[in-house]
């Protein structure tokens, strides 16, 4: 019985060249989180955070992805190509898998506001 819910930062925007925090939070369950995976819109893996062994950032993203805060992920030196969907996948025991979605829009404008609020998808 999966009782938990994933809260995410929902739809967010940030300016080109800047950085943004992708954050998900699992609530309403006592399940043990064994691993969190962060994926891009094309399902390529950005990073994983294994409960026992810590962070693993994929080589292709090592220069632009920083682990944290917490189970979140920080994307740096944003480009227009970073616009799109991002997914957090929480592998838990005994519940199973929870998945959250974030949409990031990278803006050219120097006045782009970094907007983020937690949402339940």
């Amino acid at each position: 019985m999966m009782t938990g819910t994933i809260e995410t930062t929902g739809n967010i925007s940030a300016k080109k060249g800047g950085s943004v925090i992708l954050q998900c939070h699992l609530s309403s369950t006592m399940a043990q989180v064994t691993q969190v995976n962060w994926e891009q819109h094309d399902h390529s893996l950005l990073a994983i955070r294994n409960a026992e062994l810590g962070w693993h950032i994929y080589p292709a993203f090592k220069d632009r992805v920083a682990p944290g805060p917490g189970l979140g992920l920080t994307l740096q030196s944003l480009t227009m190509n970073d616009t799109g969907e991002y997914f957090c996948t929480y592998h838990t025991y005994p519940d199973g898998t929870y998945r959250g979605r974030i949409f990031l829009e990278v803006l050219e404008s120097s006045v782009a506001e970094h907007s983020a609020r937690f949402q339940i998808p």
Epitope: T34, Q35, I48, N50, E52, L53, W55, H56, P59, P94
Partner: antibody, heavy 122, light 107 residues
Framework: QVQLVQSGAEVKKPGASVKVSCKAS????????MHWVRQAPGQGLEWMGI????????KYAQKFQGRVTMTRDTSTSTVYMELSSLRSEDTAVYYC???????????????WGQGTLVTVSS | DIQMTQSPSSVSASVGDRVTITCRAS??????LAWYQQKPGKAPKLLIS???SLQSGVPSRFSGSGSGTDFTLTISSLQPEDFATYYC?????????FGGGTKVEIK
């Protein structure tokens, strides 16, 4: 193709330490965790621990905590397992085994080394 | 830790026989179960992951089923190369734990 080549058989005295190596080839070394599993003569499989070759972080089975150390050398794509304070019950074949999938890391092993027999005898 | 109990510990069978091995977990593990085959003097070989997913190159006479706490490995028609020891392993959480093994012997 994926290959894990382990060091040769060892004979050790009780109280000594042994260090077994496992050289990986045929895949990106830092992309897969590595397990160590042992098997005493005529017995079943016993998981000892796991290491992340990228970060070097480890998780050991409680039974071996304080006696086992797993390390890696990314320049040679080699992982090591050192077991100290050896006793006769540690006589076993020691296997390194590559983790199956980092998307679900630490779950199961798909490629195994040929095994290293460690004999502890006075 | 999750305990894995396999039965029987050994089974005698003939070529062509159907062989069934069972594995029970001490707590629910959904479908996170693997089966390995080991021949004397050799390293274990992964046969099945996720309770029923056959690894590439594994003959279709092998099948796995089950979910939760009770799992089964079936060899539909035993071949000479299938005489070996089989181990189940829970694959849901560290520490990894194995069943005690089932030796399939020639009758």
């Amino acid at each position: 193709q994926v290959q894990l080549v382990q060091s040769g058989a060892e004979v050790k005295k009780p109280g000594a330490s042994v260090k077994v190596s496992c050289k990986a080839s045929g895949y990106t070394f830092t992309e897969y965790y590595m397990h160590w599993v042992r098997q005493a003569p005529g017995q079943g499989l016993e998981w000892m621990g796991i290491i992340s070759p990228s970060a070097g972080s480890t998780k050991y089975a409680q039974k071996f905590q304080g006696r086992v150390t797993m390390t890696r050398d990314t320049s040679t794509s080699t992982v090591y397992m050192e077991l100290s304070s050896l006793r006769s019950e540690d006589t076993a074949v020691y296997y390194c085994a590559r983790d199956h999938d980092i998307r679900l890391a630490g779950r199961l092993a798909d490629y195994w080394g040929q095994g290293t027999l460690v004999t502890v005898s006075s | 830790d999750i305990q894995m109990t396999q039965s029987p510990s050994s089974v005698s069978a003939s070529v062509g026989d159907r062989v069934t091995i069972t594995c029970r977990a001490s707590q629910g593990i959904s479908s996170w179960l693997a089966w390995y085959q080991q021949k004397p003097g050799k390293a274990p070989k992964l046969l099945i992951s996720a309770a029923s997913s056959l690894q590439s190159g594994v003959p279709s006479r092998f099948s796995g089923s089950g979910s939760g706490t009770d799992f089964t490995l079936t060899i539909s028609s035993l071949q000479p190369e299938d005489f070996a020891t089989y181990y189940c392993q829970q694959a849901v959480i560290l520490p990894i734990t194995f069943g005690g093994g089932t030796k399939v012997e020639i009758k």
